[in-house]
């Protein structure tokens, strides 16, 4: 069964790992919820700025006068320099971003909302954003996610139960109901048939198909041979013989005219049995102990 979740960067925690909204899917990733880390060669709060050109950016945009900037490249609006849905328009020397409501800055990368506005719901902790020139990040409590901790987490959507286990979100905890042959809090242990399994009361473990079965000693039954069996329940005595439970099995008291451990042999009128004679010391009709 192929599903595998290493306990990495909170993936088995209460919320799925989701990067900050706007983090570039091409050049950004995250290891903590709400952050945006850039792959090599990219920079900026949302990893949308190539490193090779970031040194060329003055407050008014790319400047050919900047030392070391040898990348005239394509037009200034190519590569979508405006973040957060801002629209780019070229100017004689650079570009200009027209930002949507709530965002500003050279590339619309700054959110106008601050921690003072209380943007984090459900007890989320607001970090940064002390003034309008810095963005904020909400660190969500267990059970919530989203850029503002506005969304309750379906923790089972993280698929924490391995080997086909059924995930149950009990509110206070997650529980995995494991398929036969698997165990552990996340169904991570393959019981490997009989390995580590004992059958009680002298029972023998029989392997087969990823599960185990106990072949129980006489007088015992159940999945692990822990239940004392009633040997007479199956009516083992033939031809009207009466069954008596015995510490080592059962005893059949045969009806007249029958003999054998289970009263299975008719006694001929001349006294000879149809099949093997009664064991020494037993007369036809005597109780037969079945061992």
């Amino acid at each position: 069964y192929p599903y595998d979740v290493p306990d990495y960067a909170g993936m088995l925690g209460s919320a799925p790992l989701v990067c900050r909204a706007g983090c570039s899917p091409e050049h950004g990733f995250c290891e903590q919820p709400g952050e945006c880390r850039c792959l090599e060669g990219w920079t900026g709060p949302l990893c949308t700025v190539p490193v090779s050109t970031s040194s060329c950016l003055s407050p008014r945009g790319p400047s050919s006068a900047t030392t070391g900037c040898l990348v005239p490249g394509p037009g200034p609006c190519d590569g979508n320099p405006c973040a957060n849905g801002g629209s780019c328009s070229e100017t004689p020397r650079s570009f200009e971003c027209t930002c949507p409501r709530g965002f500003y800055g050279l590339r619309c990368e700054v959110s106008g909302v601050t921690c003072a506005d209380g943007p984090c719901f459900n007890g989320g902790l607001c970090v940064g954003g002390a003034d309008p020139d810095s963005a904020y990040i909400c660190h969500c409590p267990p059970g919530f996610q989203g850029s503002n901790c506005e969304k309750r987490v379906d923790r089972c959507s993280l698929q924490p139960c391995r080997n086909g286990g059924l995930c149950l979100d009990l509110g206070h905890a997650l529980r995995c109901r494991c398929r036969a042959g698997f165990a552990g809090p996340r169904c991570e242990h393959d019981l490997d048939d009989c390995a580590g399994r004992a059958c009680a009361n002298g029972g023998t473990c029989v392997e087969g198909g990823g599960a185990h079965r106990c072949s129980c000693a006489l007088g015992f039954g159940g999945r692990d041979c822990r239940e004392r069996a009633d040997p007479c329940a199956a009516r083992p005595c033939a031809h009207g013989g009466r069954c008596y439970a015995h510490f080592s099995g059962l005893v059949c008291a045969c009806a007249p005219g029958y003999m054998g451990a289970r009263c299975e042999f008719p006694v001929h009128p001349d006294g000879a049995s149809a099949l093997p004679a009664a064991p020494p010391g037993l007369r036809p009709g005597d109780p037969q102990r079945y061992l």
Partner: antibody, heavy 120, light 107 residues
Framework: QITLKESGPTLVKPTQTLTLTCTFS??????????VGWIRQPPGKALEWLAL???????RYSPSLQTRLTITKDTPKNQVVLTMTNMDPVDTATYYC????????????WGRGTLVTVSS | EIVLTQSPATLSLSPGERATLSCRAS??????LAWYQQKPGQAPRLLIY???YRATGIPARFSGSGSGTDFTLTISSLEPEDFAVYYC?????????FGQGTRLEIK
């Protein structure tokens, strides 16, 4: 320049196992944060996400198909392999591989796709 | 599993017109929704991510809006090359799912 290319059989018989390989260039699965996924599209139908694997060997599978899917990576060869067991005619589709970054579960860069037909 | 429902299934418009495509989620996905464009015989291309951020190289006529459960992709003035199938996809939690698509065709 980043490229991804899918390869594998074009015709598979029912009950057989499909093995598809995604060979990529321009990035490495040893780079922190990088992953590769598989998406399929039956003829004339919608896209369906199948599986993802990341640089740290974390694997994600579509719940409806996870018992049939296995995704692995060969980092030195720049390859990701998807196997799908017990193929059925309804699995006939174009299979795409695409790059996806950790925590940013979108698909920014795609291969051209390979059509797999399941028929006896 | 979050189900994404796109509407309309088919939209017939002329070049120069404004196109409005809708994607509705069965539960909130915050702003974690993307739009892809797919032309016949080609792989999908990422247009918009996290509801309204344009991907690299995407023209300004494409814009996205919405949050929670209702999202819109708008093409302000249709160009001939914009006629294609458009899909939405969320990244809110597992499993990742796509919408069934909206076909934008020439009227």
């Amino acid at each position: 320049q980043i490229t991804l290319k899918e390869s594998g059989p074009t015709l598979v018989k029912p009950t057989q196992t499909l093995t598809l390989t995604c060979t990529f260039s321009g990035f490495s699965l040893s780079t922190r944060g990088v992953g590769v996924g598989w998406i399929r599209q039956p003829p004339g139908k919608a896209l369906e996400w199948l599986a993802l694997i990341y640089w740290n060997d974390d694997k994600r599978y579509s719940p409806s198909l996870q018992t049939r899917l296995t995704i692995t990576k060969d980092t030195p060869k720049n390859q990701v392999v998807l196997t799908m067991t017990n193929m059925d005619p309804v699995d006939t589709a174009t299979y795409y591989c695409a790059r996806s970054n950790w925590g940013n579960w979108y698909f920014a860069l795609w291969g051209r796709g390979t059509l797999v037909t399941v028929s006896s | 599993e979050i189900v994404l429902t796109q509407s309309p299934a088919t939209l017939s418009l002329s070049p120069g017109e404004r196109a409005t495509l809708s994607c509705r989620a069965s539960q909130s996905v915050s702003s974690y929704l993307a739009w892809y464009q797919q032309k016949p015989g080609q792989a999908p291309r990422l247009l918009i991510y996290d509801a309204f951020y344009r991907a690299t190289g995407i023209p300004a006529r494409f814009s996205g809006s919405g949050s929670g459960t209702d999202f819109t992709l708008t093409i302000s003035s249709l160009e001939p090359e914009d006629f294609a199938v458009y899909y939405c996809q969320h990244r809110s939690n597992w499993p990742i799912t796509f919408g069934q698509g909206t076909r934008l065709e020439i009227k």
